[in-house]
Each structure stands twice: as structure tokens, then as C-alpha cells.
């Protein structure tokens, strides 16, 4: 990485500089680079069973530098470490290993999940969702009058999505079948999604109950719930002639 | 579990000497620079001096330089600093540390005060 | 030599607050930075080196950030146990510099 990796030809004392090569201040045969020019950093280099001496302007992969009043000295870090800060905090670990807390893993310790991308150990992030919206006005093929049996839905909105460990979110959407009194539509009305009709809300003895938006909703059975929501809707049908009533169901 | 333990700590008289040991354990120490580091009363952290790993150098801070001197013995796992000409404004709380471009392990502290 | 100016020198918060150091540095440092803490009668504790990086042990609440000269230690909701003094220190070349301290009280 940047080197100018000064070697001598001729042989001379190592304490001898005329004659080094590239950014070297004294550098022998046997031992290539002693020291360096300003700014330089020094490193040592294996080469077989032999430590060379280099100089260079920033330390190569895997080393880290200290500017020392005399010397600007390449270190070492640790074998599985690319980056280092010293010798005890990594920064950047080699292939195949995740970074964690300035060490190099095999694997990432329990309770966290490696990044692939970024090689580190990170925090498993679960889904977190919103509290349910308002449901919306009781319809039945987009219109809010003309008929009796409709639908109303609710959503929630993500608010952090799941990391490749986390918890999935739940669903988002929910539908429910609701009742609203027989009217016919005025002229215009048709079609017309209407958020001025109140919804009465349902008793006691109603189910509030839903589930996720699902295509089996029609074609589910009647539970014992339900039946007891019909009996009660024929008894206050006479008295609440006037109010649409929102009536939850369980499939 | 790295330990660094200081002792030699005590009252001097301004212009005596006095000799601080540091004994470390827990970690390679003769991979290590060592430094001191010191803490006037009520005041903030400074630098005093650096031994780097095999004792060939040392760096001191320009408030002590010519008076203090720095070795180690890797040996035995020591930090030594002999303080000589010591002046008042050498009172501290001196703390021994392994120094790799930051202090990462730091020793309890010795109290140094001078005064006549 | 390097110098280091630390802001402020003294803080008052209460816990739950969000809290922030600043520490100017007089040349470019790259990310050659430290954070330490300091209890009364203890000796300091490495907090974050590499200007960011949580060392060991630390809470998450703490982080730092910056680079080259200005740098931050923020703590986002102080707990009891971070009321101390905090120090920042240039690693970048010798002679290693301090900053003078902050010492955050209880409001």
C-alpha cells in the first residue's frame, strides 16, 4: 500500500543512508530498510525466515501505525484482523469472521446476529407495529347504504421491520363483518363512502373480536358467539330502527 | 483479569527523589508499551511518560523531561519511574497504564506529594 | 502538541436527559480519538476509541461520533451511574493530549 520500499544493492553499514533506495533514511543489506524519511512509516516485512525492513507512506492491511516522536511505526494486529485501532480493538476482521465489540468471531454470540454485509455482530431487531387504526365505515362493495350484511377493516402500520433473526410482524390488516340499518341510497349517494354515519358501538354482549383480512371470511362457519349476536340484533331491531349497528364477528 | 498495581507513593520533600514500581499481571505486559499518566488534585488527566515494549526507547511529557526516567523489566512484569529534582507542582495522583495509541488498562493510582 | 478543547467544562442534567460533549481538536486526527470516564477516586475507564467504537462492556446509551477535529460523546438518557467526568484524548502521534474534562452533576 503506497510503498516505497527502499533497498540497497551495494553492501554498507546499517547505519550508513547514502545509497538507500525510496523512502529509506539508513537501511543495510541483510535487513533492507533501518529507518525512514519524514512522514514515512516503517514496517517490518517477512520474506521466508527473514524480517526486511520497508518504509511506507500508511501501514498495509492488518497493521496499525504510531506516531512516535522519532519514528512512525507499523504494528501488527491480531491474525484474524484486517483494521485495527491497536492490538486490542479490531475494526474491520478478515473474511469469514463477524466484529464484535472489537473482536474477530466465528460466530456471533447468542442474542445477536451476524450482518453479512457489514461482518459485524448486531442487535436482532424484532417487528414493532402500531396500534390499530379507527375501523373504517361499514361497506359493502365500496358503498355505505343499500344493503344490510357489509365489511369493515382496520390497519396498523409497521413501524420496524425485523431483522433476518427477529420476530416477523404480525398482521396488518383486519376485516370483520358489520351490519348497518337497510337504507336505500339517495340520488348521488351511490358508491359514496360515508364517514358521517355513526356507528352505534357494539354491547356487551357483542363479540369485538376480528381476525386478519383473509379470503375464508365468507365461507366460515357460524360459532355460538354469533348466534347469540343475532338473537340480541331481532330483539333491538324495533328500538334501534334509527341506528346503524356495528356488530364484530370470529371466523 | 489485568491488574496493574502501583506503589512508592508517599510525602517527599521538593528537590528529592522518589521510585514508583508498577506490577502488572493478567495480560502479555512485554507486548506493551507502558506510560504513566498523572492527576493533579482536582485537576485533569496528564501525560507523564512511555516506555514502548522492550525498553529500547522512551518519551517523556516537556513538564519532566531531564528529570524523570522511565524503565520496565519484563522479566518480572514491572514499571519503574524514578522521579528526580521533584517540584511541588508534581503532586499527583500517578497511574500506571498500558499504552497502545489509547490507555487501556489503568492501575489504581499512587499518591506523590511534594512538600516541604 | 496537539490541543484538545473540551466543552463544557461542567454540565448539571437529570437522569433521563439526553446529554452532549464536544471536543475541538487544534489539527486533523482522522479517527484517532478516545473517550474516557472517571469516578470520584477511581481511575479512568476506556469508554470509546476509534472516536466511535463502544468499548467492551459499555452501555449502549453512550456513543461517539466525528472526525478530523470536532468529535462528540453524546449519552442519550443519563442513568445515576453516568454522572462522573469524561475526558477525551488524541491518539493520533505523540505526545498523547487530554482534554481538560467535563464533570456532568446531578441537576
Known amino acids: 500500500q503506497n510503498a516505497s520500499r527502499g533497498r540497497r544493492q551495494r553492501r554498507m553499514h546499517p547505519n550508513v543512508s547514502q545509497g538507500c533506495q525510496g523512502g529509506c533514511a539508513t537501511c543495510s543489506d541483510y535487513n533492507g530498510c533501518l529507518s525512514c524519511k519524514p512522514r514515512l512509516f516503517f514496517a517490518l516485512e517477512r520474506i521466508g525466515m527473514k524480517q526486511i525492513g520497508v518504509c511506507l507512506s500508511s501501514c498495509p492491511s492488518g497493521y496499525y501505525g504510531t506516531r512516535y516522536p522519532d519514528i512512525n511505526k507499523c504494528t501488527k494486529c491480531k491474525a484474524d484482523c484486517d483494521t485495527c485501532f491497536n492490538k486490542n480493538f479490531c475494526t474491520k476482521c478478515k473474511s469469514g469472521f463477524y466484529l464484535h465489540l472489537g473482536k474477530c468471531l466465528d460466530n456471533c454470540p447468542e442474542g445477536l446476529e451476524a450482518n453479512n454485509h457489514t461482518m459485524e455482530c448486531v442487535s436482532i431487531v424484532h417487528c414493532e407495529v402500531s396500534e390499530w387504526n379507527p375501523w373504517s365505515p361499514c361497506t359493502k362493495k365500496g358503498k355505505t347504504c343499500g344493503f344490510k350484511r357489509g365489511t369493515e377493516t382496520r390497519v396498523r402500520e409497521i413501524i420496524q421491520h425485523p431483522s433476518a433473526k427477529g420476530n416477523l410482524c404480525p398482521p396488518t390488516n383486519e376485516t370483520r363483518k358489520c351490519t348497518v340499518q337497510r337504507k336505500k341510497c339517495q340520488k348521488g349517494e351511490r358508491g359514496k363512502k360515508g364517514r358521517e354515519r355513526k356507528r352505534k358501538k357494539p354491547n356487551k354482549g357483542e363479540s369485538k373480536e376480528a381476525i386478519p383480512d383473509s379470503k375464508s371470511l365468507e365461507s366460515s362457519k357460524e360459532i355460538p358467539e354469533q348466534r347469540e349476536n343475532k338473537q340480541q340484533q331481532k330483539k333491538r331491531k324495533v328500538q334501534d330502527k334509527q341506528k346503524s349497528v356495528s356488530v364484530s364477528t370470529v371466523h | 483479569e489485568v491488574q496493574l498495581v502501583e506503589s512508592g507513593g508517599g510525602v517527599v520533600q521538593p528537590g528529592r527523589s522518589l521510585r514508583l514500581s508498577c506490577a502488572a499481571s493478567g495480560f502479555t505486559f512485554s507486548d506493551y508499551d507502558m506510560a504513566w499518566v498523572r492527576q493533579a488534585p482536582g485537576k485533569g488527566l496528564e501525560w507523564v511518560a512511555t516506555i514502548i515494549y522492550d525498553g529500547s526507547r522512551a518519551y517523556f511529557g516537556d513538564s519532566v523531561r531531564g528529570r524523570f526516567t522511565v524503565s520496565r523489566d519484563n522479566s518480572k512484569n514491572t514499571l519503574y519511574l524514578q522521579m528526580n529534582s521533584l517540584r511541588a507542582e508534581d503532586t499527583a495522583v500517578y497511574y500506571c497504564?498500558?499504552?497502545?495509541?489509547?490507555?487501556?488498562?489503568w492501575g489504581q493510582g499512587t499518591m506523590v506529594t511534594v512538600s516541604s | 502538541d496537539i490541543q484538545m478543547t473540551q466543552s463544557p467544562s461542567s454540565l448539571s442534567a437529570s437522569v433521563g436527559d439526553r446529554v452532549t460533549i464536544t471536543c475541538l481538536v487544534s489539527e486533523d486526527i482522522s479517527n484517532d480519538f478516545v473517550w474516557y470516564q472517571q469516578k470520584p477516586g477511581k481511575s479512568p475507564k476506556l469508554l470509546i476509541y476509534a472516536a466511535s467504537r463502544l468499548q467492551d462492556g459499555v452501555p449502549s446509551r453512550f456513543s461517539g461520533s466525528g472526525s478530523g477535529t470536532d468529535f462528540t460523546l453524546t449519552i442519550s438518557s443519563l442513568q445515576p451511574e453516568d454522572f462522573a467526568t469524561y475526558y477525551c484524548?488524541?491518539?493520533?502521534?505523540?505526545?498523547?493530549?487530554f482534554g481538560q474534562g467535563t464533570k456532568l452533576e446531578i441537576k
Open positions: 484524548q488524541q491518539s493520533y502521534k505523540y505526545p498523547p493530549t
Open positions: 497504564t498500558a499504552h497502545d495509541r489509547s490507555f487501556d488498562y
